[in-house]
Amino acid sequence: APLVCRAGCSPEHGFCEQPGECRCLEGWTGPLCTVPVSTSSCLSPRGPSSATTGCLVPGPGPCDGNPCANGGSCSETPRSFECTCPRGFYGLRCEVSGVTCADGPCFNGGLCVGGADPDSAYICHCPPGFQGSNCEKRVDRCSLQPCRNGGLCLDLGHALRCRCRAGFAGPRCEHDLDDCAGRACANGGTCVEGGGAHRCSCALGFGGRDCRERADPCAARPCAHGGRCYAHFSGLVCACAPGYMGARCEFPVHPDGASALPAAPPGLRPGDPQRYL
C-alpha cells in the first residue's frame, strides 16, 4: 500500500494532509522538510562557522528531536547525522521498510507473497480468524453470532465452539432437540433426530408423541392369513391358522411338510404360536 506521506518526508519535521504530501512544520523547509529555515542559505547546517556564512541563528543539532524513525538511533557526523536502523528498516532516517517474505513478516500462520504493487514489498494472506497487514489482529469471530438458538460462542483460537442451551445441539446449536431433552420419550421410547426436527420411536405397546399412550399391539391386525393376535407383556403373539407359520403367519406350510422357510427355528414346530419380539 502506498505510504501516507511523501517518501523520505522527515518524520520529525514534516506531515501531510493528503497522501503523498510533505508539508513542513514551522522552522523547516525543503521537499522533505529536512532543512532548518534559519540555515537553509548557509554552507554549514550548524556550528561556529554559521556566523561567518550569514546565518544569524544557529540551527538545531542534527540529532535534535531524533530524526531516525522506526526506533532507529541517531549519531552525529561532522556534517550531518547517521541513523542506525533496526532490522527490517533502512534509508537515511530508517523510514524505508525493507521487510520481505524472507523476514517472515506474517504472523499466526499467514502466507507471505511478494506484492504485485511496486510499492508493496509483500502481502500476507491471513488464515481464518486473523486480519491486518501482518495477520497480527485476531478477528472477533463471535461478533458474527454464529451460534444459533441462543447458544454461547467460545473462540478457542484454533476453532469456534458453541455451548448450546438445553434442547439444542449441533456445531452451531442448529438442531432443536427440545422435546427429547430430559428423556422426553416415555416408556423406553428413543428420540430420533432428523432434518432438524425430532420424533419419538416408541417401544411396542406404546404410542403417541411422547410414547405415553398405551397402544393395542393387535389393533393393526398384524397376523396374516387369519392368524389370531394375542397381546403379551413383551409384545404380541400370533396363533396361526392351519397351513401357515412364521412370526406373523406369513409363510404357508407345504403339503409335503416342507415350508417356504429354510428351516424352523430350534424348539419350534410349524403351526406353533410365534412370539414377535
Epitope: L3, Q18, P31, L43, S44
Partner: antibody
C-alpha cells in the same frame, strides 16, 4: 507495473502554447507527485516543478514560473504541463517522472516529448 | 539554488575497469542525493537514492557514497552497457537540481 506514457512531439510557432500530457498506470495516481523535467542538448536536466494530483498542489522552479503550468485529471490518471509564449529556448525534450514511494527520487520516467519551436 | 557540480564532463574507461563519478553540492544536502543513467535517445534511469541505496533492479556493481557536499557513484567491473551519461540530483532543497552530467566513454 508503474508506467508513464507521454504525448507525441510537436513543432510549434514562437509565441504559441503547447500542452503535454503524461498518462499514468499501475499505481494510485492521486498519491504521488508527478515531476516535470526539461532537457536541452548541452544543458543537462532541469527540474521545472511538480504536482500532487490528489490535492492539485504544485511547486514550481522560480525559473519556470509564468512559463509552465501543471494540471492533473484524476479521472483519467493524466497529468498535463502547459508551456506558454514559446520561444526557441523552449525547444527541448520534456519528461514527466514519478516521485518514489519507498525510494525517494525519480524512479519512474515517461519516454519524453520533443517540443520544437521554429518560425 | 543548490548547484550540483560534476567536474568531469567526460571519463574514459575500459570494460572490466572500476570508475568513480563525482558530484559536489554547493551546500550541505545531507544524503538526499540520487544518481541517474541516461543513454542516447532514452529517458534517464534511476540508479541510486539517499546517496547510497540502489533502486530495485539495479546491478550491485553500482554503488553510491558520500554525505553533506561530496558524493561519488562507483561502477566496478564496467560493462559495455554502462557506457552512458550519469547525472547526480539533490532533493534536499527546492528547486530540485541536477548536475550537468558525466559521459562515460570507452578508452
Amino acid at each position: 507495473q508503474v508506467q508513464l506514457q507521454q504525448s507525441g512531439g510537436d513543432l510549434m510557432k514562437p509565441g504559441a502554447s503547447v500542452k503535454i500530457s503524461c498518462k499514468a498506470a499501475g499505481y494510485t495516481f492521486s498519491n504521488y507527485y508527478i515531476e516535470w523535467v526539461k532537457q536541452r542538448p548541452g544543458h543537462g536536466l532541469e527540474w521545472i516543478g511538480e504536482i500532487l494530483p490528489g490535492s492539485g498542489s504544485t511547486t514550481y522552479n522560480e525559473k519556470f514560473k509564468g512559463k509552465a503550468s501543471f494540471t492533473a485529471d484524476t479521472s483519467s490518471n493524466t497529468a498535463y504541463m502547459q508551456l506558454s509564449s514559446l520561444t526557441s529556448e523552449d525547444s527541448a525534450v520534456y519528461y514527466c517522472a514519478r516521485w518514489g514511494a519507498r525510494e525517494p527520487g525519480f524512479p519512474y520516467w515517461g519516454q519524453g516529448t520533443l517540443v520544437t519551436v521554429s518560425a | 539554488d543548490i548547484v550540483m557540480t560534476q567536474s568531469q564532463k567526460f571519463m574514459s574507461t575500459s570494460v572490466g575497469d572500476r570508475v568513480s563519478v563525482t558530484c559536489k553540492a554547493s551546500q550541505n544536502v545531507g544524503t538526499n542525493v540520487a544518481w541517474y543513467q541516461q543513454k542516447p535517445g532514452q529517458s534517464p534511469k534511476a540508479l541510486i537514492y539517499s546517496a547510497s541505496y540502489r533502486y530495485s533492479g539495479v546491478p550491485d556493481r553500482f554503488t553510491g557514497s558520500g554525505s553533506g557536499t561530496d558524493f561519488t557513484l562507483t561502477i566496478s567491473n564496467v560493462q559495455s552497457e554502462d557506457l552512458a551519461e550519469y547525472f547526480c540530483q539533490q532533493y534536499n532543497n527546492y528547486p530540485l537540481t541536477f548536475g550537468a552530467g558525466t559521459k562515460l566513454e570507452l578508452k
